[in-house]
């Protein structure tokens, strides 16, 4: 399976909400012996590999933000944990996998990684990740709402605030 990032760069004004999204796709075995563990974390652009470093998002670690379930089931993180930190990660039936960050501040700027791990009985794990940049801006140069720049060469498109 693979993970695709719909957008490689999100530029948002301070105070706005944003939803960062990954999509995982490929042959999905819906049998009992496969589980998908999905999570988010902050990282840095390493010299060798992007997303190797795992830093917390607003003090929540990748373990705090994880989802795990079989096949393409939907899932959400703990709501009270999410509300306390203005965060929520979620997954739908179509392979979309997102984290919503509310009331953005300049400190939220940085590289974000989504991680999907396939857990299978008697098999080594299969890990894939996606990376995207979040820029939170303030002042007259800041956009009025979040703008997402596609990972491919398509035109950028505005995204609705979460």
């Amino acid at each position: 399976f693979k993970v695709a990032t719909l957008y490689s760069l999100y530029v948002c004004p301070e105070g706005q909400n944003v939803t960062l999204t990954c999509r995982f796709f490929g042959p999905v075995d819906k049998g009992h012996d496969v589980t998908f563990y999905k999570t988010w974390y902050r990282s840095s652009r390493g010299e060798v590999q992007t997303c190797s470093e795992r830093r917390p998002i607003r003090n929540l670690t990748f373990q705090d933000l994880h989802l795990h379930h079989g096949g393409h089931q939907a899932a959400n993180t703990s709501h009270d944990l999410a509300q306390r930190h203005g965060l929520e990660s979620a997954s739908d039936h179509h392979g979309n996998f997102s984290i919503t960050m509310r009331n953005l501040t300049l400190l939220d700027s940085g590289l974000y990684c989504c991680l999907v791990v396939e857990i299978r009985h008697h098999h080594s794990e299969h890990r894939v990740h996606g990376a995207m940049e979040l820029q939170v801006q303030t002042g007259k140069d800041a956009p009025s709402s979040c703008v997402a720049y596609p990972s491919s060469s398509q035109e950028s498109e505005n995204i609705t605030a979460a």
Partner: antibody, heavy 118, light 107 residues
Framework: QVQLQQSGAELMKPGASVKISCKAT????????IEWVKQRPGHGLEWIGE????????NFNEKFKGKATFTADTSSNTAYLQLSSLTSDDSAVYYC???????????WGAGTTVTVSS | DIVMTQSHKFMSTSVGDRVSITCKAS??????VAWYQQKPGQSPKLLIY???YRYTGVPDRFTGSGSGTDFTFTISSVQAEDLTVYYC?????????FGGGTKLEIK
């Protein structure tokens, strides 16, 4: 905080079986692997295998197939390692450790000493 | 299985010295290597993950580097409490394997 509490030391006779426990607290037990690692006196670390409590998925070091059995009880957040047909080679400290999927052994139990002697 | 080789079982050093421990993988493991410290009578503790990143709360005198097959763990200024055993481990593919360990001793 995240902790793994292991059961106490065991003195066993050759040929017997022993079951070691590892109780997890401070995190969602079902969504991280529990690893089992053997360390004989004066020796290095040897991976035995792992269990993912959320699904029951298992992975073994081939060397320990037939020797080690892993189970996990999600109602009590406890993982178990059973060692069968004990010999003096099984005398060692056995550690459990947590491993979030796609990551490393980040939290370890204090270890359980198993001594096999007639 | 991937074999992790720590070529020195023992290394002599002095308090305040800089010391480096090496680990070689039998095949490419990208940066999927961790370093653990184990003091006598204690369980191992994670110090470095993904070859070069310090785990939470680990002092900055501990650093790691490398990728592919060759990895290095460095203590920039050895403290008395650092004189113990260090293990590398690969997390590239199961079965997870450890190096044989390197014991830091006083010169």
């Amino acid at each position: 905080q995240v902790q793994l509490q292991q059961s106490g030391a065991e003195l066993m006779k050759p040929g017997a079986s022993v079951k070691i426990s590892c109780k997890a607290t401070g995190y969602t037990f079902s969504s991280s692997w529990i690893e089992w690692v053997k360390q004989r006196p004066g020796h290095g670390l040897e991976w035995i295998g792992e269990i993912f409590p959320g699904s029951g998925s298992l992975n073994f070091n081939e060397k320990f197939k037939g020797k080690a059995t892993f189970t996990a009880d999600t109602s009590s957040n406890t993982a178990y390692l059973q060692l069968s047909s004990l010999t003096s080679d099984d005398s060692a400290v056995y550690y459990c450790a947590r491993r979030p999927p796609g990551w490393f052994f980040d939290v370890w139990g204090a270890g359980t000493t198993v001594t096999v002697s007639s | 299985d991937i074999v992790m080789t720590q070529s020195h079982k023992f290394m002599s050093t002095s308090v305040g010295d800089r010391v480096s421990i090496t680990c070689k993988a039998s095949q490419d493991v990208t940066t999927d290597v961790a370093w653990y410290q184990q003091k006598p009578g204690q369980s191992p503790k994670l110090l470095i993950y993904s070859a070069s990143y310090r785990y939470t709360g680990v002092p900055d005198r501990f650093t790691g580097s490398g990728s592919g097959t060759d990895f290095t763990f460095t203590i920039s200024s050895v403290q008395a409490e650092d004189l113990t055993v260090y293990y590398c481990q690969q997390h590239y593919s199961s079965p997870w394997t450890f190096g044989g360990g390197t014991k830091l001793e006083i010169k």
